[in-house]
């Protein structure tokens, strides 16, 4: 229509770490350059003072020298550490390049801080003179305090690293640095590339989501390339060997780092936080600058990193909202079947229990508010003569009374017993006259057996009942509340496996039940546990949510059923409900 | 250093019941699961279930449902296993023993011997 | 339930000798694995948690490895003392259960 916004032809980015329904799924940041204009810091740079250095390059067998000054103080003849970093352009090369001639024992450092975790998949170096004879990678986990090798490449592994030549790599020690000789010819004089793959020949590299010794292995805040020796002629001890010195330097146009900000999926990208900081911008209810711990009161299961099948995200802990800390218990998740290790700390509002689900001694459950509400549990209050004790039952609210005491607090004495003066026996029994006159009679509830039969929760599920009923579906009972005649239930549509003319969605949704129904526990009904449920169509109070009754099937859900209903909503669809 | 201190050996008659006691001490009782853990020659070592003294909630292995109950005081740190309706195959030593990172705390064993 | 098949059942070494024990798992338990040893009219006595971490004050002779389904312990020089019955078991899924148990008999 005419008031559309300018922004309507623009969908709205679809979120990378949940899928079209809501549902967590994994996500990474971008591939990067992690080192694209980063400052790397060097142990040598030439230019300071000013020297000259000579350019080699080759006609045919003989040798040219085409000599230059560098000099840190003129741009134009600077080659300073910046152009590591700078966008290459290989029609205008930029070079940073070392002093001439340090030579094997001194070396030559470049180190580059990532400023936070990355999972690196390549280290490249394109030089502007030869490749090295011998150069080492190495990479820091804690922020340049120590490091580890990366990768080692030099003719002799054994003489200058102690290391053998081209190991194979196996399972046992796929998280170890390797020496080869690949990569380290003097030619091309100039162009020349170096190029580590962190996970090249690594055995499992293709099962990497399931090997945390590998997702160890790629992992680095900063990267050192450390040049250990220089290709030479062997011109550089002759008697005109200043000449050839000077022609011996490393210089490089481009140092890349490829690879993703660490996130352990559960971020697509990495922002600055206030300090400056590059962080993850963490989903899936976790925290942290990796993503690597659960934000506060989401400890109901351990930590784990996303992988493609499994979005393990954190879950919050289920305290009923009378609790504001958890903790996670390995031993209960365990136990539980790994399903829930939360333990709610300091249970408010008289509450108590792992979940803080039950009310605490003194106190019992006001039937009539869910578990969540503030004044779900009610003060016992027992009559501090007429009560045995001061915890009355969990759900009825009924105190312990003494003999001949009645009442739901024990304030009063029962029929045929009156007041003492004791309070160890505060009612004593009545002399009992003969009887004279028939028992009154005491008007008994409506029967519930003959209204229906309650359900023992033993009930099979066949085609048959399948099709009898106009929807079936899982439900996740949240909480319950009385309206009038019915009781209104709060559930959650965990799956639709059949549905009749109105249409059925999952979420959250109203189920009605009549009060008669309940009381004669047709259906039998629990806040906070799964159901199938199987009914037929019938409009509800607020002609909205869908309705149970008597003849409804509730039962409590066990996992196994689901492929059995998929099996029988196929066969509907074939129309095998009609043959039933 | 954390001790459990069960109760004496129990003869008993078939079809009887049996409560035997865990009293711990040396460590915060709330903060760990007691398990229970049978052994006999024939089955060797089963684990029975565990209970979390921090608020009494209890797991079970699915064979000793109905045969084993467990119950905690918290005032006297001390665990209680019950076991009903007794028959020669409920003959055996049972062990309460401390969770945490594998069972490193046992106690000495309480015999049991169903006997008519 | 998880069923933790130990072996082998009965071994007979001399002092010094080296001694490994199996313990294989009917599906993954991860490093969920704890090693006992239990000496005649004690109770078990934990050397091993999470497959490979050695208890406190337990010797270095024993180690555990493993990870899934296959599970080693290992003896690496037996002593007179380590006459036991040494058990497996996983803690990674309720039921936990034990292995059938090794006897050490040192001849």
């Known amino acids: 229509g005419p008031g559309l916004s300018m922004f309507a032809g623009q969908a709205a980015q679809p979120d990378p770490c949940s899928d079209e329904n809501g549902h967590p799924r994994r996500c990474i940041p971008d591939f990067v350059n992690a080192a694209f204009g980063k400052d790397v810091r060097v142990s040598s740079t030439c230019g300071r003072p000013p020297a000259r250095y000579c350019v080699v390059s080759e006609r045919g067998e003989e040798r040219l020298r085409s000599c230059h000054l560098c000099n840190a103080s003129d741009p134009k003849k600077a080659h300073p550490p910046a152009f590591l970093t700078d966008l290459n352009n290989p029609h205008n090369l930029t070079c940073w390049q070392s002093e001439n001639y340090l030579q094997f024992p001194h070396n030559v450092t470049l180190t580059l801080s990532l400023g936070k975790k990355f999972e690196v998949t390549y280290v490249s170096l394109q030089f502007c003179s030869p490749r090295p004879e011998s150069m080492a990678i190495y990479k820091s986990m804690d922020y340049g305090r120590t490091w580890v090798p990366f990768q080692f490449y030099s003719t002799q592994c054994r003489k200058m690293y102690n290391r053998p030549h081209r190991a194979p790599i196996t399972k046992q020690n796929e998280q170890e640095a390797v020496c080869t000789d690949s990569h380290t010819d003097m030619r091309p004089l100039s162009g020349g590339l170096i190029a580590f793959s962190t996970l090249d020949g690594r055995p499992s590299a293709h099962d990497f989501d399931n090997s945390p010794v590998l997702q160890d292995w790629v992992t680095a805040t900063d990267i050192r390339v450390a040049f250990s020796r220089l290709h030479t002629f062997g011109d550089e001890n002759e008697d005109d060997s200043e000449l050839a010195r000077d022609s011996y330097f490393y210089a490089v146009s481009d140092l890349q780092v490829g690879g993703r900000c660490k996130c352990n999926g559960h971020a697509a990208r990495c922002v600055r936080d206030r300090d400056d900081s590059l962080v993850c911008d963490c989903r899936h209810n976790t925290a942290g600058p990796e993503c690597d711990r659960c934000k506060p009161f989401h400890y109901d299961r351990p930590w784990q990193r996303a992988t493609a099948r499994e979005a393990n995200e954190c879950v919050a802990c289920n305290c009923n909202l009378h609790a504001r800390r958890c903790r996670f218990n390995m031993e209960l998740y365990k136990l539980s079947g790994r399903k829930s290790g939360g333990v709610c700390l300091n249970c408010r509002h008289n509450t108590a229990g792992r979940h803080c689900h039950y009310c605490k001694e003194g106190y019992y459950r006001d039937m009539g508010k869910p578990i969540t509400h503030r004044k779900a549990c009610k003060a016992c209050d027992c009559h501090p003569v007429g009560a045995a004790g001061k915890t009355c039952n969990q759900t009825t609210g009924q105190c312990p009374c003494k003999d001949g005491v009645t009442g739901i607090t024990c304030n009063r004495c029962a029929k045929g017993y009156q007041q003492s003066r004791s309070p160890i026996a505060p009612c004593i029994k009545i002399p009992v006259a003969p009887p004279t006159t028939a028992a009154s009679s005491v008007e008994e509830p409506e029967d519930c057996d003959s209204y229906c039969k309650a359900s023992k929760g033993k009930l099979k599920i066949n085609m048959k009942k399948y099709c009898k009923k106009d929807y079936a579906v899982q439900i996740h009972i949240l909480k319950a509340d009385k309206a009038g005649d019915w009781w209104k239930f709060t559930v959650n549509i965990i799956s639709v496996y059949k549905q009749g003319t109105s249409r059925i969605r999952r979420g959250d949704q109203s189920l009605w039940i009549r009060s008669r129904d309940i009381a004669c526990k047709c259906p039998k009904i629990k806040p906070l546990k799964k159901y199938l449920l199987l009914g037929n169509a019938e409009d509800s109070p607020d002609q909205s949510g869908i309705v149970a009754d008597k003849s409804s099937l509730v039962i409590q859900w066990r996992d196994t059923w689901a492929r059995r209903l998929r099996k029988f909503q196929q066969r509907e669809k074939k129309g095998k409900c009609k043959k039933a | 250093q954390a001790y459990l201190q069960q109760s004496g050996a129990e003869l008993v008659r078939p079809g009887a019941s049996v409560k035997m006691s865990c009293k711990a001490s040396?460590?915060?009782?709330?903060?760990?699961?007691m398990h229970w853990v049978k052994q006999t020659p024939r089955q060797g070592l089963e684990w029975i279930g565990a209970?979390?003294?921090?608020?009494?909630?209890?797991s079970y292995n699915q064979k000793f449902k109905g045969k084993a109950t467990l119950t905690v005081d918290k005032s006297s740190s001390t665990a209680y296993m019950q076991l009903s309706s007794l028959t020669s195959e409920d003959s055996a030593v049972y062990f309460c023993?401390?969770?945490?990172?594998?069972?490193?705390?046992w106690g000495q064993g309480t015999l049991v011997t169903v006997s008519a | 339930s998880i069923v933790m098949t130990q072996t082998p059942k009965f071994l007979l070494v001399s002092a010094g000798d080296r001694v490994t024990i199996t313990c294989k798992a009917s599906?993954?338990?991860?490093?969920?694995v704890a090693w006992y040893q239990q000496k005649p009219g004690q109770s078990p006595k934990l050397l091993i948690y999470?497959?490979?971490n050695r208890y406190t004050g337990v010797p270095d002779r024993f180690t555990g490895s493993g990870y899934g389904t296959d599970f080693t312990f290992t003896i690496s020089t037996v002593q007179a003392e380590d006459l036991a019955v040494y058990f497996c078991?996983?803690?990674?899924?309720?039921?936990?259960?034990f292995g059938g148990g090794t006897k050490l008999e040192i001849k």
């Open positions: 023993a401390r969770g945490g990172t594998g069972f490193a705390y």
């Open positions: 040396g460590y915060t009782f709330t903060s760990y699961n």
């Open positions: 209970i979390y003294p921090g608020n009494g909630d209890t």
């Open positions: 599906q993954s338990v991860s490093n969920d």
């Open positions: 999470y497959a490979s």
């Open positions: 078991q996983q803690d990674y899924s309720s039921p936990w259960t």
